[in-house]
């Protein structure tokens, strides 16, 4: 279970090449573990496969397999990153008929510096 807050190593292949290697669940969408997140992330992967934004893969990984650092912080994606990706990929999102999750609506995320991320308490819902 996830009653104790502990970072865990990333096992989702697509995200194993990210600059971070530890994560925590549940994520923003409430996915309970990495296997569920990987399946749900699959719906968005054509956006990455067609490279609609240079930041798409980073954003998807940070959203579905969030950064976990120092055993005490979970790091959601920053709003600016979200806005950039959504703007870049909007046409393709519509073309594929992809439903963008409410939890990933950019105005729900906080402005922050990607190098000094905002953190949130993993035991309370993050609304930004």
């Amino acid at each position: 279970g996830h009653s104790l807050f502990t970072c865990e190593p990333i096992t989702v292949p697509r995200c194993m090449k990210m600059a971070y290697n530890m994560t925590f669940f549940p994520n923003l969408m409430g996915h309970y573990d990495q296997s569920i997140a990987a399946v749900e992330m699959e719906h968005f992967l054509p956006l990455a496969n067609l490279e609609c934004s240079p930041n798409i893969e980073t954003f998807l990984c940070k959203a579905f397999v969030p950064t976990c650092i120092e055993q005490i912080h979970v790091v959601p994606p920053c709003r600016k990153l979200c806005e950039k990706v959504y703007s870049d990929c909007k046409k393709l999102i519509d073309t594929f008929g992809i439903r963008w999750p409410e939890e990933l609506e950019c105005d729900r995320l906080q402005y922050c510096d990607e190098t000094v991320p905002v953190t949130f308490d993993p035991h309370t819902e993050f609304l930004g």
């Epitope: 699959e42 054509p46 067609l50 393709l92 073309t95």
Partner: antibody
Framework: EVQLVESGGGLVQPGGSLRLSCAAS????????MSWVRQAPGKGLEWVAL????????FYGESVKGRFTISRDNSKNTLYLQMNSLRAEDTAVYYC????????WGQGTLVTVSS | DIQMTQSPSSLSASVGDRVTITCRAS??????LNWYQQKPGKAPKLLIY???SLQSGVPSRFSGSGSGTDFTLTISSLQPEDFATYYC?????????FGGGTKVEIK
């Protein structure tokens, strides 16, 4: 009425080049990824290349990579396929279409590579 | 690359028959699967997109189902104009790939 009209096909010798064009009308060209698909005589469909909305992204099938170049001119509503170093196995009818999904198709243009 | 395997490669059926064609992807493609119909000498025509969405203007006797790796195209009651070759195609990742086709012939 949506129309995609291919041109530029014909007979070419092995090692030669051809440039195919596809003139689009009846829809907002720049709102679609565009692609080329080919069909060798009596065979199935094979995807050749795909280009993004503004032409900055191109993707290619393994069999044509490094020989073919896909491009587009949104001001002219036209898609192109530059084919170099042609081989006998490139002989096919070439169709242009809206790439994702392949909703609108042209009637095709025949490319024959033979000596 | 994602391989798409269609079966059968051909089938004989009569008008009014229910026809089922299957398509299997070599890895999960979520629901990014399209079906096309092609008649001799003509360009393919999109029938179904996103695995189960019927393209506008396509008769409701055509339906698609499946997700992940296994997909099905069903023609509930075959009509004379349905004798053609059918192709599945994945748009999950490049290279975009087609199945080998299923030729539906008159019995």
């Amino acid at each position: 009425e949506v129309q995609l009209v291919e041109s530029g096909g014909g007979l070419v010798q092995p090692g030669g080049s051809l440039r195919l064009s596809c003139a689009a009308s009846g829809f907002t060209f720049s709102d679609h990824y565009m692609s080329w698909v080919r069909q060798a005589p009596g065979k199935g469909l094979e995807w050749v290349a795909l280009v993004g909305y503004d032409g900055s992204q191109q993707f290619y099938g393994e069999s044509v990579k490094g020989r073919f170049t896909i491009s587009r001119d949104n001001s002219k509503n036209t898609l192109y396929l530059q084919m170099n170093s042609l081989r006998a196995e490139d002989t096919a009818v070439y169709y242009c279409n809206t790439g994702i999904p392949m909703l609108y198709w042209g009637q095709g243009t025949l490319v024959t590579v033979s000596s | 690359d994602i391989q798409m395997t269609q079966s059968p490669s051909s089938l004989s059926a009569s008008v009014g028959d229910r026809v089922t064609i299957t398509c299997r992807a070599s890895q999960s493609i979520s629901s990014y699967l399209n079906w096309y119909q092609q008649k001799p000498g003509k360009a393919p025509k999109l029938l179904i997109y996103a695995a189960s969405s019927l393209q506008s203007g396509v008769p409701s006797r055509f339906s698609g189902s499946g997700s992940g790796t296994d997909f099905t195209l069903t023609i509930s009651s075959l009509q004379p104009e349905d004798f053609a070759t059918y192709y599945c195609q994945q748009s999950y990742s490049t290279p975009l790939t087609f199945g080998g086709g299923t030729k539906v012939e008159i019995k």
